[in-house]
Amino acid sequence: AVDLTLLANLRLTDPQRFFLTCVSGEAGAGRGSDAWGPPLLLEKDDRIVRTPPGPPLRLARNGSHQVTLRGFSKPSDLVGVFSCVGGAGARRTRVIYVHNSPGAHLLPDKVTHTVNKGDTAVLSARVHKEKQTDVIWKSNGSYFYTLDWHEAQDGRFLLQLPNVQPPSSGIYSATYLEASPLGSAFFRLIVRGCGAGRWGPGCTKECPGCLHGGVCHDHDGECVCPPGFTGTRCEQACREGRFGQSCQEQCPGISGCRGLTFCLPDPYGCSCGSGWRGSQCQEACAPGHFGADCRLQCQCQNGGTCDRFSGCVCPSGWHGVHCEKSDRIPQILNMASELEFNLETMPRINCAAAGNPFPVRGSIELRKPDGTVLLSTKAIVEPEKTTAEFEVPRLVLADSGFWECRVSTSGGQDSRRFKVNVKVPPVPLAAPRLLTKQSRQLVVSPLVSFSGDGPISTVRLHYRPQDSTMDWSTIVVDPSENVTLMNLRPKTGYSVRVQLSRPGEGGEGAWGPPTLMTTDCPEPLLQPWLEGWHVEGTDRLRVSWSLPLVPGPLVGDGFLLRLWDGTRGQERRENVSSPQARTALLTGLTPGTHYQLDVQLYHCTLLGPASPPAHVLLPPSGPPAPRHLHAQALSDSEIQLTWKHPEALPGPISKYVVEVQVAGGAGDPLWIDVDRPEETSTIIRGLNASTRYLFRMRASIQGLGDWSNTVEESTLGNGLQAEGPVQESRAAEEGLDQ
């Protein structure tokens, strides 16, 4: 069972001093987000017993394995059901405490009732403040039964539940009709899933015979020991004031466990600590009684004395629960109450015994749960004891359960049962997860879900190149940390598998499923530099770069050009997908913008070092287009152009540029400057006769503007072939701007 205890402080004179504490003795309990242990939860459960809302209760965590609930302001805050939840996974367990108001009309004679399947349970509510009206019994908040007030027997209302079954478990209450629910007597009924002394599916297995009021768990056959007792069968008493499965916890305060109610996992329920009794656990046991709720009687023989915490204290020469066994009777010594082995191991189990006559090898035997008897293979004889060693055949899961070491001599016999837990080594159900990769390393999360039993003591990561027959490389890692596999080959697939181990010999599980993880390409190492750049328009930039010469093939797939517009906080990226390219035209840029420019080589997804940056200023965009361009032939070699100035000019025009092209011709156009910006007409001379020409023009301020519409016009016929078109007021060699 899970080592979980819910303590209620029952010193009820002041509700504000009342507290509930949940203590877990489980390894790693309460660490919260830790994958190996969910947190302890402690809360009031208002589903069945609803109380008026009050200020919220305060929850305080004390270390990783303890949580305390305080902040009760009035007695009614205390009434009802509280629960603590602890343990991980399939071991998650809820411990329940039911609190009754000491001033209620009806009080339970006993709050927790643990009964076996098929038993008759009797709940008894004692009249504390009489009302001459019906008593309503409820089960888990729903109507269950009615008693007339005349039906009280010796001042008690009894509810008989014959032939109880596990679904009958729950919270029962007895309430007078018309009375406040807070005046009810609240009970908790726990019905074990099996008949007395049985456990397991089908209730076929025999309980170990729990001592000192321990209760056999119907699922796993373990004894849930009362507070203050320990051992597989609760055979050992803790020191006064201690509790927990290994007596590892100490009761708070100077008066030890006085005034504390202890609630343990079902099917135990709640009781006072060892040595105490009464509704508030403040009364010491009467002489001759001991244990939780003082339910046990000593009946010591042979001069033994009764200790209210531990039972009979035997004089020299006697032992046994009632000091009924002479020390001459053989006795099993120091047998561990619980042993754990891994599946398919062949452990050695030792069993020591003393007595008179002295036990010999053949007088000590080991009995497995299936009844098989093992004889010892060797014995070590010492003056005060004989230790028999048993070689156990390969363990199977069915070997889990209660084993027994038995010694028999002519002086009598003794036996000691102990629990053997056969654990299944853990096997990963999934492959490890790749977190990040580089060219020579992989970062892997090895923590995966697994079948079998924890805790995980070590994690081994096995890896080797895919399709390789070489030996696996192995790295041993901490279960909760990510692993970096180093010194790998770039651009290589690796098969990676996890192997988990649990403590103990043979705790290594089978390897988990493989997964393929591929290292990245090698990083490109060459740093380009920018050779130059020039503006090809207000929004176009041609860039060229170089790489250092190195021997061997170039490691790279292409280049990445980056333009950073600091004013707008925008980055433009241009991918050049050939590693041989050394120039690129960047278009669609923003005129008048200051850019920072660099280039870097890339390989796969990895970027090499960036070139030293260059700073480039694109000219601002030019003025709008001239309007209403018109062409008129004047002669066989002259055409006059007329236009209107552009509208909404951002500044004074410095010149116009006219583009002249023969219609349908394949040659490049000619550009002619008109340097007098105030003009709205010009004559283009030196044209060929009978030839159709296309004209368009644009203005320039700091940069060239937009082109106007294109116009067509033909020169007149019969002229001589001209040398080429010129503008009226300039010589041709001055005006041409190819």
Epitope: I136, F144, Y145, T146, L147, D148, H150
Partner: antibody, heavy 122, light 111 residues
Framework: EVQLLESGGGLVQPGGSLRLSCAAS????????MNWVRQAPGKGLEWVSV????????YYADSVKGRFTISRDNSKNTLYLQMNSLRAEDTAMYYC???????????????WGQGTLVTVSS | QSALTQPASVSGSPGQSITISCTGT?????????VSWYQQHPGKAPKLMIS???NRPSGVSNRFSGSKSGNTASLTISGLQAEDEADYYC???????????FGTGTKVTVL
């Protein structure tokens, strides 16, 4: 589904006896208080008697006290009303009714049978 | 224990609201919140309509509502419908040895 079925009614002479039965099904009969309620022809409802789940407590209307006896057999899920020294004014439809409880635990008659007619006449 | 007092009859037109009163003593209606109301159509068994003064069981129309003031409990039927025509009885838990007492009954007629 909760069902209550009365039987045993009929014509009886004044001073005679009759035993009514009520067979219950669809609920845990042994956990509930059970009642007999009667209604004379053209008149209102009159509560007659109640018996507690264990059978350990019974109560009667003044008009029938000493003449009628309510009982139950929890093993047979059956409620009974033994009527002795019958009078003409006992002529009525006799209903058996279960006491149920609301969320605030008030007792009321939540399920009724269809009734059995008792006629006391010479 | 005498019966609780109810009006012999109450009538109303469809869609109207009507209220039936039920007057008792401090030993019954006034002493407990345990008043219930039953509807009975001719030739049929009574049916629980209201419990605990104002608690409507599932399946009962929300046109039926109950209340209590002092020694008098009331049943209100709003939006009266033809199928509401029936006899209505109140009942109370009582402190006397009779435990339960019914009202004299009210015949509701839908005009």
């Amino acid at each position: 589904e909760v069902q209550l079925l009365e039987s045993g009614g009929g014509l009886v002479q004044p001073g005679g006896s009759l035993r009514l039965s009520c067979a219950a099904s669809g609920f845990t009969f042994s956990n509930y208080k059970m009642n007999w309620v009667r209604q004379a022809p053209g008149k209102g409802l009159e509560w007659v008697s109640v018996i507690y789940p264990s059978g350990g407590a019974t109560y009667y209307a003044d008009s029938v006290k000493g003449r009628f006896t309510i009982s139950r057999d929890n093993s047979k899920n059956t409620l009974y009303l033994q009527m002795n020294s019958l009078r003409a004014e006992d002529t009525a439809m006799y209903y058996c009714a279960r006491v149920g409880y609301s969320s605030s635990w008030d007792p009321h008659f939540d399920y009724w049978g269809q009734g059995t007619l008792v006629t006391v006449s010479s | 224990q005498s019966a609780l007092t109810q009006p012999a009859s109450v009538s109303g037109s469809p869609g109207q609201s009507i209220t039936i009163s039920c007057t008792g003593t401090s030993s019954d209606v006034g002493g407990y919140n345990y008043v219930s109301w039953y509807q009975q159509h001719p030739g049929k068994a009574p049916k629980l309509m209201i419990s605990d003064v104002s608690n409507r069981p599932s399946g009962v129309s929300n046109r039926f509502s109950g209340s209590k003031s002092g020694n008098t409990a009331s049943l209100t039927i709003s939006g009266l419908q033809a199928e509401d025509e029936a006899d209505y009885y109140c009942s109370s838990y009582t402190s006397s040895s009779t435990l339960y007492v019914f009202g004299t009954g009210t015949k509701v007629t839908v005009l």
